[in-house]
Amino acid sequence: EPPTACREKQYLINSQCCSLCQPGQKLVSDCTEFTETECLPCGESEFLDTWNRETHCHQHKYCDPNLGLRVQQKGTSETDTICTCEEGWHCTSEACESCVLHRSCSPGFGVKQIATGVSDTICEPCPVGFFSNVSSAFEKCHPWTSCETKDLVVQQAGTNKTDVVCGPQDRLR
């Protein structure tokens, strides 16, 4: 009796179970009662990453330098190329099809997490006692200067964008 279901890594065709092609190979011809499934290797710059019955391999992804992309990991016959972004840029999506410039944190905000090839800069507002007076993709919020440790007094209070200004203590007359 012809099978109605096949084992893992097999498929049903013409009332018989044929082996799927292994990753890195494509289907040329189904099996027959005389011969096994005919599979051939994917060509250069092609891949198939699963057990399959595909008659065509997929093209490796192209990391387009015009979009700020570069190769992070070269593809094989079984894996796609992985793209990432040039220094200072990050991917716009998980698939990393294009890149945008890392965001800078404005004055009053500091870098909570430095950007990577796949994630943007994360900024945080400088809390009381901290400031940032530059627009930067790297600088964290800096603590206000401690006037006391310098035997000085606060002459001008700090803000989230400016440091405190210290000055000499008034002498007792």
Partner: antibody, heavy 115, light 111 residues
């Protein structure tokens, strides 16, 4: 069991074209590639190219590039091989066969090129 | 691609073994385990007897065996019989959807 039945013998003049057909029965037509192979009298086998009936994509041996065209008609489960600009040295038996592995063969079609 | 190299002829007596070689390059025989062997009797279409370098289609007797070392594939016919007298061809996948044949070997069964 796949069976491949080819068209009959042809006699052609130099410079003309020939179109040989190969009709498949048994199995699923779109699930195997078809190779074309020729054999000149008293000579060895020569692979000419292949066609993948599922998408119609072709691959031709460098020697025949520009002179050979392989097509398919899914409605009749038939593939065709057309060779143009025929010369006397194209006189041969032309075979179609299943896959690159060529596990089933047509009976062959004799093409004679003579003035 | 240039043809694979086979000896033009080989011979043996009934019951003996004979081996036919098929030499290619590192771009075909050496690169892939996709060598096939065919038997062709005069006036007939070729018949597949070995595929994927060493596998036999069902129905092909185990007197036919094959192997590969480097860029050379070999077909061995053991226990030679009169009906084994035929032409034998090897073929190999050569990458990029291309295939190449050997020039063929005429096997004669003596006696």
């Amino acid at each position: 069991q796949v069976q491949l039945v080819q068209s009959g013998a042809e006699v052609k003049k130099p410079g003309s074209s020939v179109k040989v057909s190969c009709k498949a029965s048994g199995g699923t037509f779109s699930s195997y590639a078809i190779s074309w192979v020729r054999q000149a009298p008293g000579q060895g086998l020569e692979w000419m190219g292949m066609i993948n009936p599922s998408g119609g994509t072709t691959s031709y041996a460098q020697k025949f590039q520009g002179r050979v065209t392989m097509t398919r008609d899914t409605s009749t489960s038939t593939v065709y091989m057309e060779l143009s600009s025929l010369r006397p040295e194209d006189t041969a038996v032309y075979y179609c066969a299943r896959g690159f592995r060529m596990d089933q063969w047509g009976q062959g079609t004799l093409v004679t090129v003579s003035s | 691609q240039s043809a694979l190299t086979q000896p033009p002829s080989a011979s043996g007596s009934p019951g003996q073994s004979v081996t036919i070689s098929c030499t290619g390059t590192s771009s075909d025989v050496g690169a892939y385990n996709f060598v096939s062997w065919y038997q062709q009797h005069p006036g007939n279409a070729p018949k597949l007897i070995i595929y994927d370098t060493r596998k036999r289609p069902s129905g092909i007797p185990d007197r036919f065996s094959a192997s590969k070392s480097g860029n050379t594939a070999s077909l061995t016919v053991s226990g030679l019989q009169a009906d084994d007298e035929a032409d034998y061809y090897c073929s190999s996948y050569a990458g990029n959807n291309n295939l190449v044949f050997g020039g063929g070997t005429k096997l004669t069964v003596l006696g």
